[in-house]
Interface confidence: low
């Protein structure tokens, strides 16, 4: 690629490149990876400015500005299944190279919660306008695209390449051209900082003459955190120009000798480095006295210094080291505060979720809301929790108290509910009578009926129509309270007795209905069943005082 055909900005310890291309986020990340980088991070306002600069370069390379919005992928993504966290600046997104808790963000608009698909972030640019330094591109989140379908308005992407350090650009003391080739395969002749391991090709001369010389240099680490080209003195010097061409390539002062030669010098408070071109501050910070991420600020005239901490940190008692500020001491959150390095985040207690005005507010989760109730029957939402309830005839059950279990009224603690036979049903019960007896209108007592040799009356199955000796004999009428929603009985007898419908016949039924032949254990011998004198009936012979029960599931209900 020819020099300056690519958009590249280097600053601090990283370089940023911007590229056109209608690609998915994954394809863009792959291209950055191929050259040893990632999709760009924007972890601070300073970094946002570098990214804006490289995008401005890219836009300048396009012949005309177009009247449309364009999006450029950066390396901020949220995996499928990970939900939005409104309390964090990054809202639960994280940088592809690592890092979730960076404090800077610049969202285009409030994010909508969606956990079901991977989401990616792009920078939103108005391509009809030149980029203004004060208006940093906003972050827009959306689907990550797929090969051949990058997503709406995706125009390109920004890569970031990190380095141990940077060399200063080579300064020429006479006519010539410098071309830098970076480790990420970009060539440029106008870098403000040149990354470690870059090569510099210096072609001296006017360009149209054959007297041009070429020099090659490599940006190396000369000492820990000290990077330079290993060149000595200004390059491409010419007696014809002396100090007049580019200040002789000198960083600060240029001193001419009488013979057309010249030397570089430095102003008070600075010293000339080994390259005989660059000046460095003769400052008290050169020994790096500040620790723990603190920045050393030299005092005036090269005397004294102060250490400054990044936001969210403060100097310790030594005034040299940075320690994390515990923002949680200020109680900035409604419920739970988690201190993090340089910041904090708010969390909500179990039974609450983020919400309500302001930062760190929590609101009650309505566990009983439609479709999310954990209760089998009734559910009541409470502040921070909930509780379950059961309809009449059921009791709470299960380890967590969310299930409802049928109460067997036939063996209830209040003693027999029926005067003779008792049938437990789901949520209720029915009464029945021994042969020769019929159920009284109160649905509980038995009265002497027509002489019959049939079995006890009052079967579990109300739908049954049985035939015996040519006649249809419907089951005994038994009834139980009907129930409304949330466990509210529509009609509940005060004595918990089954209700009898007015048109129900009182009769006996075939034995086969109650106990099909060969079905063991359903009934004890009829002789043990009894009626009481409540209806003026007499107790049959062999009167045992127990009450027989049968559950609807066909098991013996007597416990």
């Amino acid at each position: 690629t020819g020099a300056d055909t690519e958009a590249v900005v280097c600053a601090g310890t990283a370089c940023y490149t911007a590229h056109w291309g209608k690609l998915s986020a994954a394809e863009a990340q792959n291209l950055c990876l191929q050259n040893g980088g990632n999709l760009a991070t924007v972890k601070s306002e300073e970094e946002a400015q570098h990214v804006q600069q490289v995008l401005a370069q890219l836009l300048r390379r396009e012949a005309a500005l177009t009247a449309r919005m364009g999006k450029f992928w950066i390396g901020l993504q949220r995996e499928k299944g990970k939900c939005l966290d409104p309390s964090l600046p990054l809202k639960g997104f994280s940088w592809v190279g690592g890092g979730e808790d960076t404090p800077y963000s610049n969202w285009h608009k409030e994010l909508r919660n969606s956990c079901i698909s991977k989401r990616c972030v792009s920078l939103l640019l108005d391509l009809s306008q030149p980029l203004l330094p004060g208006r940093l591109p906003k972050w827009s989140e959306g689907p990550c695209g797929s090969p051949g379908s990058p997503g709406s308005n995706i125009e390109g992407f920004v890569c970031k390449f990190s380095f141990k350090g940077m060399c200063r650009p080579l300064a020429l003391g006479g006519p010539g051209q410098v071309t830098y080739t970076t480790p990420f395969q970009t060539t440029s002749s106008s870098l403000e900082a040149v990354p470690f391991a870059s090569a510099a090709n210096v072609a001296c001369g006017e360009g149209d003459k054959d007297d041009s010389q070429s020099h090659y240099f490599l940006c190396k680490e000369k000492a820990p955190d000290v990077f330079d080209w290993g060149s000595s003195g200004p390059l491409c010097v010419s007696p014809k120009y002396g100090c007049n061409f580019n200040n002789g390539g000198c960083h600060q002062d240029c001193f001419e000798g009488g013979d057309g030669s010249f030397l570089c010098g430095c102003r008070p408070g600075f010293r000339l480095l080994d390259d005989l071109v660059t000046c460095a501050s003769r400052n008290p910070c050169s020994s790096s006295p500040c620790r723990g991420g603190a920045t050393c600020i030299p005092g005036p005239h090269g005397k004294n210094y102060t250490c400054r901490c990044p936001q969210g940190y403060q100097l310790d008692s030594s005034q040299l080291d940075c320690v994390d500020v515990d923002e949680c001491q200020d109680s900035p959150c409604a419920q739970e505060c988690v201190n993090t390095p340089g910041s904090f985040r708010c969390e909500c207690w179990v039974g609450y979720e983020p919400g309500g005005p302001g930062e760190g507010a929590c609101q009650d989760v309505d566990e009983c809301a439609l479709g999310r109730s954990p209760c089998a029957q009734g559910c009541t939402n409470t502040e921070g929790s909930f509780h379950c309830s059961c309809e009449e005839g059921y009791v709470l059950a299960g380890e967590d108290g969310t299930q409802c279990q049928d109460v067997d009224e036939c063996v209830g603690p209040g003693g027999p509910l029926c005067d003779s036979l008792c049938f437990n049903t789901q949520g209720s019960f029915r009464c029945g009578c021994l042969p020769g007896w019929v159920l009284a209108p109160n649905g509980v007592s038995c009265a002497m009926g027509p002489v019959s040799l049939g079995p006890p009356s009052g079967p579990p199955d109300e739908e049954y129509k049985g035939e015996r000796e040519g006649s249809t004999v419907p089951p005994a009428a038994t009834a139980s309270p009907t129930r409304g929603p949330e466990g509210t009985p529509k009609s509940t007898p005060t004595t918990r007795r089954p209700l009898l419908s007015s048109d129900a016949p009182i009769t006996s039924v075939p034995l086969e209905v109650l106990a099909p032949s060969g079905s063991p254990g359903l009934w004890r011998e009829p002789s043990i069943h009894h009626t009481t004198a409540a209806s003026g009936a007499q107790e049959p012979a062999g009167g045992d005082s127990s009450v027989a029960t049968q559950n609807d599931d066909g098991t013996d209900g007597q416990k």
């Epitope: 404090p103 109680s331 409604a334 005005p357 930062e359």
Partner: antibody, heavy 116, light 107 residues
Framework: DVNLVESGGGLVKLGGSLKLSCAAS????????MSWVRQSPEKRLEWVAT????????YYLDTVKGRFTISRDSAENTLYLQMSSLISEDTAVYYC?????????WGQGTLVTVSA | DIVLTQSPATLSVTPGDSVSLSCRAS??????LHWYQQRSHESPRLLIK???QSISDIPSRFSGSGSGTDFTLSINSIETEDFGMYFC?????????FGAGTKLELK
């Protein structure tokens, strides 16, 4: 220590404009929501506007919507309230507040007087 | 908008007395209610957050209670520095609103 210092108040004509500033120090400004709250001469407190920690969300009292703009400069640790089309009901002491659980910290206030 | 009604408007007490200030919301605000004190010629300061949660550096004689629509600020054994205005504020929904205040004055 948390410190909030308001400035920019003064006497302004009906329909005029004014920009209030609030210099914040002693805490990580970019971590917190910030608000403006005003107090009328009758001592009634009224919330005016809130801005989220990164500046991407703003909320306004209905009566100031479209006339007031809340903004922040995290590099300068400064909160702003640009007021225009001022009416007599806007006369009040304007407080800059840091929002956490309620209005956790308040400045000393700056008086805005709207005259006919 | 949620309206907060404070009562009484004025309360005359002597140091050593204990008092209860009431704040009633026009609709349920759960526990999203905060209390502020404003002494003469000073800015308001947060006393109680979320109806009953104490704030560091605020004397323990100040306490809050209530949930839903009815809230109370209690001051146990009033001291001279406690005289001034007391405001309640809700953060349940936008717009954030304040009560008109209760003035606590020396009898």
């Amino acid at each position: 220590d948390v410190n909030l210092v308001e400035s920019g108040g003064g006497l302004v004509k009906l329909g005029g404009s004014l920009k209030l500033s609030c210099a914040a120090s002693g805490f990580t400004f970019s971590n917190y929501y910030m608000s403006w709250v005003r107090q009328s001469p009758e001592k009634r407190l009224e919330w005016v506007a809130t801005i989220s920690n990164n500046g991407d969300s703003t909320y306004y009292l209905d009566t100031v919507k479209g006339r007031f703009t809340i903004s922040r400069d995290s590099a300068e640790n400064t909160l702003y309230l640009q007021m225009s089309s001022l009416i007599s009901e806007d006369t009040a002491v304007y407080y800059c507040t840091r929002v956490g659980t309620g209005f956790t910290y308040w400045g000393q206030g700056t008086l805005v007087t709207v005259s006919a | 908008d949620i309206v907060l009604t404070q009562s009484p408007a004025t309360l005359s007490v002597t140091p050593g007395d204990s008092v209860s200030l009431s704040c009633r919301a026009s609709q349920s605000i759960n526990n999203y209610l905060h209390w502020y004190q404003q002494r003469s010629h000073e800015s308001p300061r947060l006393l109680i957050k979320f109806a009953s949660q104490s704030i560091s550096d605020i004397p323990s004689r100040f306490s809050g209670s209530g949930s839903g629509t009815d809230f109370t600020l209690s001051i146990n054994s009033i001291e001279t520095e406690d005289f001034g205005m007391y405001f309640c504020q809700q953060s349940n929904s936008w717009p954030l609103t304040f009560g008109a205040g209760t003035k606590l004055e020396l009898k």
